[in-house]
Interface confidence: medium
């Protein structure tokens, strides 16, 4: 017993040591070494049956969905899927895990967030990190050069998520992508149109779509004097401009990231600008930027993009923002991100955007990474951040104290007297066969009041009441739960009457 206590103390101390090293940002090797020691000690300790230490919970960064949350989720998915289909997309699915090799080298610094699986019969596997890389692998594997597809599925990231803000380790992504060689900016404009259509339909508040181009970023950093090795890290600083002032961003770039102050100043001149097509035109006149081939290409494409966005009627939702610098390594052209606009109590207390609710861009080189001959398939796409949207919709409904129906039942088959279970079973079966969503209470002789109460709680609009008299007369009493008005309906007309009242098509097409 004393031996166990001593071991427990060692585990505690070693745990504190590991935490300390992590806080001090010690080297990965040292941390790994100390973690291994900790695991060894824990293994020595073994299970302790005397202590019921197991806490019943979902793993970190995951959650269960209640029927209420699922109802919200299905409504959101319905809006998204209808929009994707309206734009002519097909649907695909891919495995939840991929060969580790498929995902390696596609995400830059974010690769450390990939979940690796333990050995599965020789293959090194990882859970998918997004839906884009598996899509590129699918195109290369099937030698496809042309497809417009959507894919809604869960992805996995070993992040430290702020779940209150709708961030998780397991979460849904809703992706729409167009692959193929097309005239410039037409598919890109459609992706932005889709993004705006979905966010408008969801009615989650005012939003803005920031647009930039990877080539403009590359060109801008090149003429400002940022070395290739610093590109990624400077991008991540610049990307904070929507949350903090330029002063703070500059301090980070110079103080923490070793950028020369004059280089930072040159970057500041560019990234503190946003606007519409007029800013694109202004930058096309810029003596330095217009001399950079990459930047010039990007600006030319953005000018064209704005023309199409105007034709699509969404140019007022788009802001060309030179500080938009986030994104994965695979983007090659236009990048965009939709942010919800909020109203902080005081300026400077918190950022304007509650965070990205959708993002996307052009990635012309990703499929080529999987092709033995390096053949490229140009792609552009978008991803809707549904988890964040679920959180927003849930919060809004809670604030409005709105009741959400968690079932779609149209009618409850009820009885007013005892000994009518057989009749209820016969009737509910008739309704099911006719495509009516119907329920009954699982009791032989339920009280009518209990049946009506169940309808009110579940939001079921109609009750079909069977009584002895009704059986003799060949009718069913159809009662509206909200108005409480009752009518006798001939049994053969019941299906049609329920469909008429609930707005369901009269044939199951």
């Amino acid at each position: 017993m004393a031996e166990r206590a001593a071991l427990e103390e060692l585990v505690k101390l070693q745990g504190e040591r590991v935490r300390g090293l992590k806080q001090q940002k010690a080297s990965a090797e040292l941390i790994e070494e100390e973690v291994a020691k900790l695991l060894k000690l824990k293994a020595q300790l073994g299970p302790d049956e005397s202590k019921q230490k197991f806490v019943l919970k979902t793993p970190k960064g995951t959650r269960d969905y209640s029927p209420r949350q699922m109802a919200v989720r299905e409504k959101v998915f319905d809006v998204i899927i209808r929009c994707f289909k309206r734009h002519g997309a097909e649907v695909i699915d891919t495995p939840v895990f991929e060969l580790k090799e498929t995902l390696m080298g596609k995400y830059g610094e974010d690769s450390k967030l990939i979940y690796d699986l333990k050995d599965q019969g020789g293959e090194l596997l990882s859970l998918r990190y997004d839906l884009t890389v598996p899509f590129a692998r699918y195109l290369a594997m099937n030698k496809l050069t042309n497809i417009k597809r959507y894919h809604i599925a869960k992805v996995y990231r070993r992040d430290n998520p702020a779940m209150t803000r709708g961030r998780y380790r397991e979460f849904y992504q809703c992706d729409f992508d167009i692959a193929g060689n097309f005239d410039p900016m037409i598919p890109d404009a459609e992706c932005l149109k889709i993004m705006c259509e979905i966010l408008s339909s969801l009615q989650i508040g005012d939003f803005l779509v920031k647009v930039n181009d990877r080539r403009i970023l590359d060109g801008m950093f090149a003429i400002c004097g940022v070395s290739d090795s610093k590109f990624r890290t400077i991008c991540s600083s610049v990307d904070k401009l929507d949350k903090v002032s330029w002063e703070e961003v500059k301090n980070e770039m110079v103080g923490e990231k070793g950028l020369a102050p004059e280089v930072a100043d040159r970057i500041g001149d560019y990234v503190q600008q946003h606007g519409g097509v007029s800013l694109v035109e202004q930058l096309l006149q810029d003596p330095k930027l217009s001399q950079n081939k990459q930047a010039l290409e990007g600006l030319g494409d953005l000018k064209l993009l704005f023309e199409y966005l105007t034709l699509f009627g969404i140019d007022d939702k788009i802001s060309f923002d030179l500080s938009l610098a986030r994104g994965l390594d695979y983007y090659t052209g236009v990048i965009y991100e939709a942010v919800l606009l909020q109203t902080p109590a005081q300026a400077g207390e918190e950022p304007l955007g509650v965070g990205s609710v959708a993002a996307g861009g052009r990635y012309d080189g990703l499929v080529g990474m999987f092709d033995p001959k390096g053949r490229k398939v140009p792609c552009v796409g978008l991803s809707i951040g549904v988890e964040r949207i679920f959180s927003i919709v849930e919060q809004r409904l809670e604030a409005l104290e709105e009741k959400i129906r968690t079932t779609e039942t149209q009618v409850l088959v009820a009885s007013a007297q005892k000994k009518l279970l057989e009749e209820r079973l016969k009737l509910v079966s008739e309704l099911w066969d006719a495509g009516i969503k119907a329920e009954l209470l699982y009791k032989k002789n339920p009280k009518l009041l209990n049946q009506l109460q169940y309808c009110e709680e579940a939001g079921i609009p109609l009750v079909a009441i069977i009584g002895e008299q009704e059986l003799k007369d060949g009718v069913i009493k159809l009662r509206s739960v909200t108005s409480r008005e009752e009518v006798d309906v001939r049994r053969e007309d019941l299906v049609e009457e329920i469909k008429r009242r609930t707005g369901q098509p009269l044939c199951i097409c």
Partner: antibody, heavy 120, light 107 residues
Framework: QVQLVESGGGLVKPGGSLRLSCAAS????????MTWIRQAPGKGLEWVSY????????NYADSVKGRFTISRDNAKNSLYLQMNSLRDEDTAVYFC?????????????WGQGTLVTVSS | DIQMTQSPSSVSASVGDRVTITCRAS??????LAWYQQKPGRAPKLLIF???SLQSGVPSRFSGSGSGTHFTLTISSLQPEDFATYYC?????????FGQGTKLEIK
């Protein structure tokens, strides 16, 4: 605290020139875009020009393009507006303001203004 | 250029009143809008940015709303120091244009 003080205004004949200055204090001048905004007597406000933190970037309203030049000296914490070929319609109070990019382009701090009168 | 139109051009009100000023943009500007207050012989003072965000130090009786092309500035309970001219300004694209102003006078 943030302070902006304009100077250099006065009476000038049409076709003449004038140079306005704005002395800034209370913040890291070189980290901010700066702007000139004007207001004709009894009229509304008009954004004239802006300049980026390190002098590289300038922009002008069409009404002054080719005639006005905005510049700055970060070592002296000063902003300037060189006004050439002045016209009657340039008569206004000229304000210098700190232009804040974060969230929207706005003037979050303004000077008290200097009056420019163009008249023969 | 984006045109900004304010209404009314002047309004008379009493201390304690609720006042609303409207600003319309000739094209959609999302939430890229600011409101300023200007007193005679003084520089404008920033009240609201991003259509509805209150500038630090500005009393909470001032609030802004709207997006796209239609915006409002509301003063929930007028104070003696609020009598001034109010301007809206679009910040979507340069040249950043102002409304013609709304003069708030004592009734």
């Amino acid at each position: 605290q943030v302070q902006l003080v304009e100077s250099g205004g006065g009476l000038v004949k049409p076709g003449g020139s004038l140079r306005l200055s704005c002395a800034a204090s209370g913040f890291t001048f070189s980290d901010y875009y700066m702007t000139w905004i004007r207001q004709a007597p009894g009229k509304g406000l008009e954004w004239v020009s802006y300049i980026s933190g390190s002098n590289a970037y300038t922009n002008y309203a069409d009404s002054v393009k080719g005639r006005f030049t905005i510049s700055r000296d970060n070592a002296k914490n000063s902003l300037y507006l060189q006004m050439n070929s002045l016209r009657d319609e340039d008569t206004a109070v000229y304000f210098c303001a700190r232009y804040v990019y974060q969230v929207v382009a706005i003037g979050d701090y303004w000077g008290q203004g200097t009056l420019v009168t163009v008249s023969s | 250029d984006i045109q900004m139109t304010q209404s009314p051009s002047s309004v008379s009100a009493s201390v304690g009143d609720r006042v609303t000023i409207t600003c319309r943009a000739s094209q959609g500007i999302s939430s890229w809008l600011a409101w300023y207050q200007q007193k005679p012989g003084r520089a404008p003072k920033l009240l609201i940015f991003a259509a509805s965000s209150l500038q630090s130090g500005v009393p909470s009786r001032f609030s802004g709303s709207g997006s796209g092309t239609h915006f409002t500035l509301t003063i929930s309970s007028l104070q003696p120091e609020d009598f001034a001219t109010y301007y809206c300004q679009q910040a979507k694209s340069f040249p950043y244009t102002f409304g013609q102003g709304t003069k708030l006078e004592i009734k």
